[in-house]
Interface confidence: low
């Protein structure tokens, strides 16, 4: 590309527009598959997170690897291709009219991506149309250096958005989690995700989900009634991937939403969540930005108690300890609180029914100039058996019309040199947040009270 294209709602044409389903549709998959078979997997999973600036936890608190560091490292490992699915891109401060030094990590990431293209590593981006970041020029900048960009018209196709957030690097490494390609995700918003290294089986399975977006990003694309066979997955909740992660016996699979973008063999995201909840016998701890047992974006709004019922049933019928940590920020919709109070009202310790709900408030401090920040954007759940890391908020639309992915991981505890299982690490991160001064019980949150840190 010789031109940095001006902002446009139209299609950024990649070099390889597919002529038919499943033929020539992959930006870099075919040559990689053969390559990857020659290499032995030695999967490793690392939890990653962003802790907003000026959000100190108690000294000695556990923490995951910083997300910005993990992203830069992933790009350093890239040798052939980087495929990114992200709701929107906004890696520089002026994108949103902000001049703040905390955007520099995002700008460093954009610089790294430009260097990557200079090294003849292919970059393919699937992003949402419509987008939130209308003024961002990140993708024009990258297209100028040769990136292939497709804007997936989920609004037209399913009345949703492309809300997924994941990377597939060289068909071997993965990032997935709550963070968009946004500088605020690195320094101003609390995020949680996972990086999986050297795991071609899982990476190429997630790549198939990327390919569903890719083929829908061409002009006049339509949703297929049945997805072609080459999009099918053989890794799902009935047949998870089984392998050693740092020597620890592990099962894992990726789920996806909406069902219309789940080719044969792909476990729908909602089904994965319900399965993890259903298998819990001791506890279910969930941290999500939003919790609505309703639709959120379709009108008239419908009641949708699927996840709510599953939590209630686990607590009431099996005595599972349920803890729900929901974000509370300046942009939080206050109509969420009655649903949270209703869920907590089920709690009855005398009858061994334990349901606790807290809101997590990130102090705004002197960062009030940065819009849509200072929130806990994480979307994860952990039980004694499994870790679930997702990209979706908990309301109907995210599972019925909007794209997302989930990662379900179970590790066998035992005498392992590598330390705690993934689910134990995630539990500890949850407990850190839950017991911190930023997590406030609903009783401390008066009806209609703003989500402003009271200190």
């Amino acid at each position: 590309w010789q031109v940095r294209r001006p902002p446009t709602w139209g299609q950024v044409q990649p070099k390889d527009v597919p002529r038919s389903w499943g033929h020539g549709s992959s930006p870099a998959l075919e040559p990689l598959e053969a390559e990857v078979r020659k290499q032995r997997d030695s999967c490793q999973l690392v939890l990653v997170e962003s802790i907003p600036q000026d959000l100190p936890f108690a000294a000695g608190s556990l923490s995951a690897q910083p997300l910005g560091q993990a992203w830069l490292q992933l790009l350093d490992t890239a040798q052939e291709s980087v495929h990114v699915a992200s709701y929107y891109w906004s890696l520089t401060g002026p994108d949103i009219g902000v001049n703040d030094s905390s955007s520099q990590l995002g700008e460093a990431l954009l610089q790294k991506l430009q260097q990557l293209l200079g090294r003849n590593i292919s970059l393919a981006v699937a992003t949402s149309s419509p987008t939130l970041a209308r003024k961002s020029t990140d993708l024009q900048v990258l297209a100028a250096r040769g990136a292939q960009v497709r804007r997936v018209p989920m609004g037209r196709l399913t009345r949703g958005v492309l809300h997924s957030k994941f990377w597939v690097v060289d068909g071997r490494h993965i990032y997935m989690g709550s963070a968009n390609m946004d500088w605020r995700s690195l320094t101003q918003v609390k995020e949680l995700g996972a990086v999986i290294y050297n795991c071609s089986h899982l990476a190429q399975d997630l790549e198939k989900t990327f390919q569903t977006y890719w083929v829908l990003g061409v002009p006049k694309a339509v949703l297929p009634k049945t997805w072609p066979q080459n999009f099918s997955s053989h890794i799902n909740r009935f047949q998870p991937f089984q392998g050693l992660f740092d020597g620890v016996p592990t099962t894992a699979y990726f789920s996806a939403s909406p069902p219309a973008l789940c080719p044969q063999g792909r476990t729908p995201d909602l089904e994965a969540l319900l399965a993890v909840m259903g298998s819990a016998q001791e506890f279910i701890y969930a941290s999500v930005m939003e919790y609505f047992p309703t639709t959120r974006f379709s009108h008239p709004r419908r009641y949708w108690p699927v996840l709510d019922n599953a939590l209630r049933a686990a607590a009431f019928s099996k005595g599972v300890r349920v803890r729900l940590l929901v974000s509370c920020g300046l942009n939080t919709d206050p109509t969420m609180f009655p649903y949270l109070r209703s869920l907590q009202a089920l709690s009855n310790p005398a009858a061994n029914v334990s349901v606790d709900v807290k809101v997590f408030i990130v102090p705004v401090g002197n960062h009030s100039n940065i819009p849509f920040s200072r929130v806990n954007h994480s979307k994860f759940m952990v039980t004694e058996k499994a870790a679930y890391i997702g990209t979706s908020n908990w309301s109907e639309d995210y599972f019925s019309s909007t794209t997302g992915v989930g990662l379900v991981v179970t590790q066998s505890p035992g005498a392992q040199p590598a330390g705690a299982t993934v689910q134990e690490q995630l539990r500890q991160l949850f407990e850190r947040d839950w017991s911190s001064r930023y997590a406030v019980g609903l009783d401390g949150q008066a009806p209609g009270q703003d989500c402003v840190w009271q200190g």
Partner: antibody, heavy 118, light 107 residues
Framework: QVQLQQPGAELVKPGTSVKMSCKAS????????MHWVKQRPGQGLEWIGD????????NYNEKFKSKATLTVDTSSSTAYMQLSSLTSEDSAVYYC???????????WGQGTSVTVSS | DIQMTQTTSSLSASLGDRVTISCRAS??????LNWYQQKPDGTVKLLIY???RLHSGVPSRFSGSGSGTDYSLTISNLEQEDIATYFC?????????FGGGTKLEIK
């Protein structure tokens, strides 16, 4: 610290070619674009093109496509620009500059003064 | 190509003055605007990149602002060492293009 070293001057005859160098130090040469910029006496700056030493990828200003050829030698961390079929219009100072964050040219060489004269 | 126009080709100011140099692009360049200083001996330095980001080692008296097509460089407290020619450059659309320069002199 980042340094870009260029020879001070070149005197060449019309119709011939000249190949000027830019030796980089103080950073990873293969990780940054190298730009070349022309400045005629008493005039402004004109971007000629850039090259990525890690892969030899190049971009050229259309105006200089048949005039300039950009190359690198990664073993010596040196970028080169060859100008061909020289005329008096090519008499100028030529700068190399490293492409830094967001494509800003963050470090510049001292410039090579090329004089085309018979 | 995008044309970059610096309407003031030369500017006289006194030491200690606040000086503003402007630059206009022929189309929206989305903040991809850089400012350079060229000393009389030909030495070129980056001052500001991406409209308002100060390059390392540049004194804080230099600042940049703007958006869309209109941008400016401000020197808040002019010093003798600031005597130079200042160029703007857009990095939004290849080929990168420079303004004609503004020569700053002491009154």
């Amino acid at each position: 610290q980042v340094q870009l070293q260029q020879p001070g001057a070149e005197l060449v005859k019309p119709g011939t070619s000249v190949k000027m160098s830019c030796k980089a130090s103080g950073y990873t040469f293969t990780s940054y674009w190298m730009h070349w910029v022309k400045q005629r006496p008493g005039q402004g700056l004109e971007w000629i093109g850039d090259i990525y030493p890690g892969s030899d990828s190049t971009n050229y200003n259309e105006k200089f496509k048949s005039k300039a050829t950009l190359t690198v030698d990664t073993s010596s961390s040196t970028a080169y620009m060859q100008l061909s079929s020289l005329t008096s219009e090519d008499s100028a100072v030529y700068y190399c500059a490293r492409g830094g964050w967001l494509d800003a040219m963050d470090y510049w060489g001292q410039g090579t003064s090329v004089t085309v004269s018979s | 190509d995008i044309q970059m126009t610096q309407t003031t080709s030369s500017l006289s100011a006194s030491l200690g003055d606040r000086v503003t140099i402007s630059c206009r692009a022929s189309q929206d360049i989305s903040n991809y605007l850089n400012w350079y200083q060229q000393k009389p001996d030909g030495t070129v330095k980056l001052l500001i990149y991406y409209t308002s980001r100060l390059h390392s080692g540049v004194p804080s008296r230099f600042s940049g602002s703007g958006s869309g097509t209109d941008y400016s460089l401000t020197i808040s407290n002019l010093e003798q060492e600031d005597i130079a020619t200042y160029f703007c450059q857009q990095g939004n659309t290849l080929p990168w293009t420079f303004g004609g320069g503004t020569k700053l002199e002491i009154k």
